[in-house]
């Protein structure tokens, strides 16, 4: 099964699970759970690229990232298929594959991905801003359709010629930023008990001030941690979590796949994940979004009150102490 | 300050098909995901889909309610998605609306929503 890798988002530990487990929970075991990869969902991915050397052909590679089976691929450019798009190439595992110019050489690279060049000559040829679809229809899964088009930043002048894509490039530094982050954490951590270990262990003596001060400094340095820690959310590699589709739909195409087997067999609908997600009836708006990102599989975006710096109840003072402000 | 206007909406015929647009327009250079939701009359708002940009990859989900119907594209260059509607029901009746988010959701803009009326 080829899945999407995700790094979720970091997110502070949730107050109630918090409180349940005191204060002394450091965040740096949930900081690891939420870096464990998870596998997507049913996904389509369309990659656009212009040839450096010849500036009128295009290589159009398309992957489906499901556990299904690939019963039919239809590649076409202009916009959807259904929607005024004109079909370049239609793929199929076992009857072959029929391209149409300009479409110059149709393949299968893997058997969820495919890939297209286009020759790029005369009326016909492909311009810049075109936009290319590929139509995937998958047993169980269904039908899954998505478009492309060449980036903005792309100057074929400059760019190198085509390497195998690398499907989380682009998401590198986001990721090597929250490792680092998380390595500075560790560090500063590790620092912070040290420092506690080598302490000097402190005389009893009468206290002048308030019964809660020593409360406040013995637990300083892991709030302190905790704070350090607390990233603000962070979208690496976000992944909707659709559910999967209950019927295949097959494209038409051309006459001679008329004979096609429909496939119409049904996925038992089991809970999706995101399904219990409470969403407000009524509240804030910030509310409301989270619950429709946390649906949806995002994360939501964090701007309401939710994320605080002090989990504990009595706020921002009880820093104070050896790493607080006085 | 970056805005998301939705347009395309209005009747339609069960069984019919309609484009919404979705374009984001000032700050928007870096706008890394665009979707839509949708809210019927007396529901939560729901995911419909979404496309994401990464580098020259497109990377496009349904929620499960699409079954094939929808179609979701759009262009990075230009800020714009689109949701093309195929054999629409009476079900399909709600408002949608656009999202756009940049990277690590410093930009997160919504537009104020299209109305999309399916009649039987």
């Known amino acids: 099964m080829r899945t999407e890798a995700q790094v979720p988002a970091l997110q502070p530990p949730e107050p109630g699970l918090e409180g349940a487990m005191g204060h002394r929970t450091l965040v740096l075991p949930w900081v690891l759970l939420t870096l464990c990869v998870t596998a997507g969902t049913p996904e389509v991915w369309v990659q656009v690229r212009m040839e450096a050397t010849e500036l009128s052909s295009f290589t159009i590679r398309c992957g489906f990232l499901g556990s299904g089976s690939i019963s039919l691929v239809t590649v076409s450019w202009g916009g959807p298929n259904g929607a005024g798009g004109t079909t370049l190439a239609v793929l199929h595992p076992e009857r072959g594959i029929r391209q149409w110019a300009p479409a110059r050489q149709a393949r299968w690279e893997t058997q969820s991905s495919i890939s297209l060049i286009l020759e790029g000559s005369g009326a016909s040829s492909p311009c810049a801003n075109t936009t290319f679809c590929c139509k995937f229809a998958s047993f169980p899964e269904g039908s899954w359709e998505a478009c492309g088009s060449l980036p903005p930043s792309s100057d074929p002048g400059l760019s190198a010629p085509p390497t195998p894509a690398p499907i989380l490039r682009a998401d590198l530094a986001g990721i090597l930023g929250v490792s680092g982050v998380l390595l500075f954490g560790c560090v500063y951590l590790l620092h912070l008990l040290r420092r506690h270990k080598h302490r000097p262990a402190p005389r009893l003596q009468p206290s002048r001030t308030s019964p809660q001060a020593p409360r406040a400094r013995a637990w300083a340095p892991s709030q302190a941690s905790q704070a350090a820690l607390h990233v603000p959310y962070a979208t690496i590699n976000t992944s909707c979590r659709p559910a999967t589709l209950d019927t295949a739909h097959p494209h038409g195409g051309p006459s001679w796949w008329a004979s096609l087997p429909t496939h119409a067999a049904h996925r038992p609908q089991g809970p999706a994940a995101w399904a219990s997600t409470p969403i407000p009836a009524r509240g804030s708006f910030v509310s409301v979004e989270n619950g429709l990102y946390a649906q949806a599989g995002e994360r939501p975006p964090h701007t309401g009150p939710g994320l605080t710096l002090f989990p504990d109840p009595r706020g921002p003072r009880a820093m104070e102490g050896p790493l607080g402000v006085r | 300050e970056v805005q998301v206007v939705e347009s395309g909406g209005g009747l339609v015929q069960s069984g019919g098909s309609l484009r919404l647009s979705c374009a984001a327009s000032?700050?928007?250079?870096?706008?890394?995901?665009m979707g839509w939701f949708r809210q019927a009359p007396g529901k939560e708002r729901e995911f419909v889909g979404r496309i994401k940009w990464s580098g020259d990859t497109t990377y496009t989900s349904y929620a499960d309610f699409v079954k094939g119907r929808f179609t979701l594209y759009g262009n990075q260059a230009r800020n714009t998605v689109y949701l093309q509607m195929n054999s629409l029901k009476p079900e399909d009746t709600a408002v949608y609306y656009c999202n756009g988010r940049s990277r690590f959701n410093v930009i997160n803009a919504w537009g104020t929503g299209t109305l999309v009326t399916v009649a039987s």
């Open positions: 000032g700050r928007t250079r870096s706008m890394y995901v």
